[in-house]
């Protein structure tokens, strides 16, 4: 008998969608061998129509795809559109279409529910509204007016116009007599319930001559809608539940064992403390919408989401709801890239971001993640040259090393620092990626001295002693901006005296500035790289005054100052500062601790074994 | 939390036909399979079948064992499953057991579901 398994049956309605799910052994060469999905012809024959090596069918075509899941020993043929003529007997399977590896799959599709004779069919989702029209004649304007719902062979009372109302309605149901010019009760029915499901009978007047009006409510449960993500990458859930429920509190949850539905995060102030720093619930539209954005994705984010509306901020009976299922790839396209980066006060860290190497000329953003109400993420810098003012002198983002990465260096540390940050672009939006930063204890570094004044048309020179461990770094001066760090000429001075235990190896660079003049004015770095990978850095402030005594200035180590409009990220990106950005929703990633390694380069961290990595800005 | 209660069962003749049902109650909109699995004595609890659904598509799973023979369905109205079992054979005795699960991800795994009715019990006397 074959290995593989899948549903023998699958039933379904024209237009609707299936998601057919095949196991098979989770073997090396199962794992990696072609899937394919065939349609059983008459004479025996089995007609490709979809498979794992990127064939598709042009019976198929924009509305199939096939996912594998390596890891689960799975795979998910999708097919969307369902008509009639998809009725047939097809087989999944691995490797050759003739051979034994495969399953036998009936697909039925039906044609849609047809009205029945004088009855009205009333299809609504699962918490929603559903309001029945029920008309009547004239002789019966001033007689009772009912609902009845029919149980087996009973109708059971629901409501009347004298005030009754059935108790499992209570609170969710009332019965509206039109104006007298028209002859029509109806019936709202709130916060639909699965059990309200079934065949209604409405009613005017109690004798022979009453008027009666079949109704079938048919409630659905919402289809999950099925989303493949990448491992590390991102996923938007956009959820509209309708205007009714525009006031009512807003959840998502993720269903676990038994009737559970655990809250991720709503919008009364609840996260679940595993999506921190990772999650974001933009704020809802008038309508009702809004969106929750899940960055860093893990293996084990997948599985069942449900967001809905209910004023406890959790799933209940008859919350209006939205099902997605969601499933998380592990053969990534998004590289591993450091989870948690440390660097110590004063010090720096230097951050590389991954973004879909496709798209090397979107701009580049970062920004901190806020925790507060239902989260959010002010723009600290992008790549255009917008650097938010508190941060002028110590944040850059610099397009290096290019192809897939750029890099983010921050500076003059302070503990105000630690805490969640987001790389992004305005492109592809499942690249959303997010780092902690933590600051530990320690020293920075690099030795830069604190404020330095230049005289006019003098001479400045700028000392910044670098440890022996750089010794195979390349070691650099430049003058911040906004959209960048201008690399400018400095000298190598020789060892330096400012470590102990530290041998020749140690080095004073120096950076001079000639004939000073007002536009020298500014943020200095000096720091270490490794070709395009930056590591530590350190910021001196130079200020500029008028020549008070002739001569040159030599600055000595003294102790650096910190130097002293608000971008804000969100799903849609408002507009900010006459920017607009297109859509680059939000982002995140797995936090980890793994050793940490005194490591000048800040950005490039050594990844372990497990999901977890940090990097090392400073070391201790 | 969702109450399973099942019925239907008793001793039939080998060849027979038995037709079981399982109605589930208390928050039965949060679940997404119902299936049936069995335990013969000193035997491991072993799956029978499932049917999973998605809006109006149905998705029904069944043991090499019972291909042909059993069959699975369900009424939504009535959040009842059945298993219609035909040629029932002497090796089909066990106590069958109904399940239902939230989120299932191999509906032959007995763990992958949530909630477990009490059983009852088939016997096939050849």
């Known amino acids: 008998k074959s290995p593989i398994f899948g549903p023998e049956e699958v039933n379904s309605v024209e237009g609707n969608s299936v998601s057919i799910t095949c196991y098979y052994p989770p073997t090396s060469v199962n794992r990696h061998t072609r899937k394919y999905w065939c349609r059983q012809g008459a004479r025996g024959g089995c007609i490709t129509l979809i498979s794992s090596e990127g064939y598709v069918s042009s019976k198929y075509a924009g509305r199939a795809n096939l996912t594998n899941f390596p890891e689960n020993g799975t795979f998910v043929v999708n097919i969307a559109q369902l008509s009639q003529d998809d009725s047939g007997r097809y087989k999944c399977g691995l490797g050759i279409n003739s051979r034994g590896l495969s399953f036998d799959v009936s697909l039925e599709v039906s044609q849609g529910p047809g009205l029945l004779n004088d009855t009205k069919v009333y299809t609504v989702d699962l918490g929603r509204t559903v309001t029945i029209n029920c008309p009547f004649k004239t002789e019966n304007a001033q007689k009772r007016k009912s609902l009845y719902k029919q149980i087996g062979l009973y109708p059971v009372l629901v409501i009347d116009s004298s005030g009754y109302v059935n108790p499992n309605y209570t609170g969710r149901i009332r019965l509206d007599i039109q104006g007298t010019g028209q002859l029509l009760f109806s019936v709202v029915i709130n916060q639909l319930r699965l059990s309200d499901a079934g065949q209604y009978l409405c009613q005017a007047g109690d004798d022979s001559n009453s008027n009666k009006k079949n109704a079938d409510l048919q409630v659905l449960k919402p289809e999950p809608e099925l989303v493949y993500e990448d491992l590390r990458g991102s996923v938007t859930f956009h959820c509209a539940l309708g205007p009714e429920v525009a006031n009512v509190a807003k959840f998502l949850c993720r269903q676990s064992s038994g009737e559970n539905c655990d809250v991720v995060v709503n919008t009364l102030g609840k996260r679940a403390p595993a999506f921190e720093g990772r999650i974001l619930l933009n704020p809802q539209d008038k309508d009702g919408s809004f969106s929750v954005v899940i960055t860093g994705l893990r293996k084990e984010d997948a599985g069942r989401y449900l967001c809905g509306a209910h004023s406890d901020g959790q799933l209940q009976e008859g919350s209006p709801i939205q099902a997605w299922q969601l499933f998380v790839n592990e053969e990534s396209t998004i590289p591993r890239s450091p989870t948690v980066v440390k660097g110590v006060a004063g010090g720096s860290v230097a951050v590389l971001c991954p973004y879909n190497r496709k798209e090397s000329k979107s701009i580049k953003y970062w920004c901190l993640w806020e925790g507060a109400q239902n989260g959010r993420c002010p723009l600290l810098v992008d790549s255009e040259g917008w650097v938010k003012a508190q941060y002028e002198g110590r944040l850059s983002l610099l397009e290096e090393p290019g192809n897939g990465t750029f890099t983010v260096i921050l500076n003059q540390l302070t503990s105000r620092d630690a805490g969640f940050y987001w790389c992004l672009t305005n492109g592809d939006t499942l690249w959303r990626t997010t780092v902690e930063i933590k600051i530990i204890e320690g020293e920075p570094n690099l030795k830069v001295p604190g404020n330095v004044t230049a005289v006019l048309g003098e001479t400045l020179k700028v000392p910044c002693h670098f440890p022996c461990k750089f010794s195979s770094y390349e070691k650099y001066w430049c003058k911040w901006n906004n959209t960048g760090c201008q690399a400018l000429p400095s000298q190598d001075e020789g060892p330096s005296k400012a470590f102990v235990n530290c041998d020749e190896n140690s080095r004073l660079v120096s950076l001079t500035l000639n004939l000073v003049t007002r536009a020298d004015e500014g943020w200095y770095w000096c720091g270490v790289k490794q070709g395009h990978f930056y590591g530590e850095t350190a910021a001196v402030y130079v200020a500029v005054e008028e020549r008070k005594a002739a001569g040159s200035r030599d600055v000595s180590l003294a102790k650096a100052d910190a130097a002293p409009d608000e971008k804000v990220l969100d799903s849609g990106f408002r507009e900010i500062e006459n920017k607009a950005i297109q859509d680059p929703r939000l982002f995140a990633e797995e936090k980890a601790v793994a050793d940490t390694r005194d490591q000048a380069d800040g950005s490039r961290a050594s990844v372990d074994s497990g999901s977890s990595e940090e990097q090392g800005g400073s070391s201790r | 939390q969702v109450q399973l209660v099942e019925s239907g069962g008793g001793l039939v003749q080998a060849g027979d036909s038995l037709r079981l049902s399982c109605a589930a109650s208390g928050r039965t909109f949060t679940t997404y399979g119902m299936g049936w699995f069995r335990q013969a004595p000193g035997k491991e609890r072993e799956f029978v079948t499932t049917?999973?659904?998605?809006?109006?598509?149905?998705?029904?799973y069944y043991a090499d064992s019972v291909k042909g023979r059993f069959t699975i369905s369900r009424d939504n109205a009535k959040n009842t499953v059945y298993l219609q079992m035909n040629s029932l054979k002497p090796d089909d005795t066990a106590v069958y057991y109904c399940?239902?699960?939230?989120?299932?991800?191999?509906?032959?795994?007995?763990?992958?579901?949530?909630?477990w009715g009490q059983g009852t019990q088939v016997t096939v006397s050849s």
């Open positions: 049917i999973t659904w998605s809006g109006s598509t149905n998705y029904k």
């Open positions: 399940a239902a699960s939230t989120v299932l991800r191999d509906p032959r795994v007995p763990t992958e579901y949530d909630y």
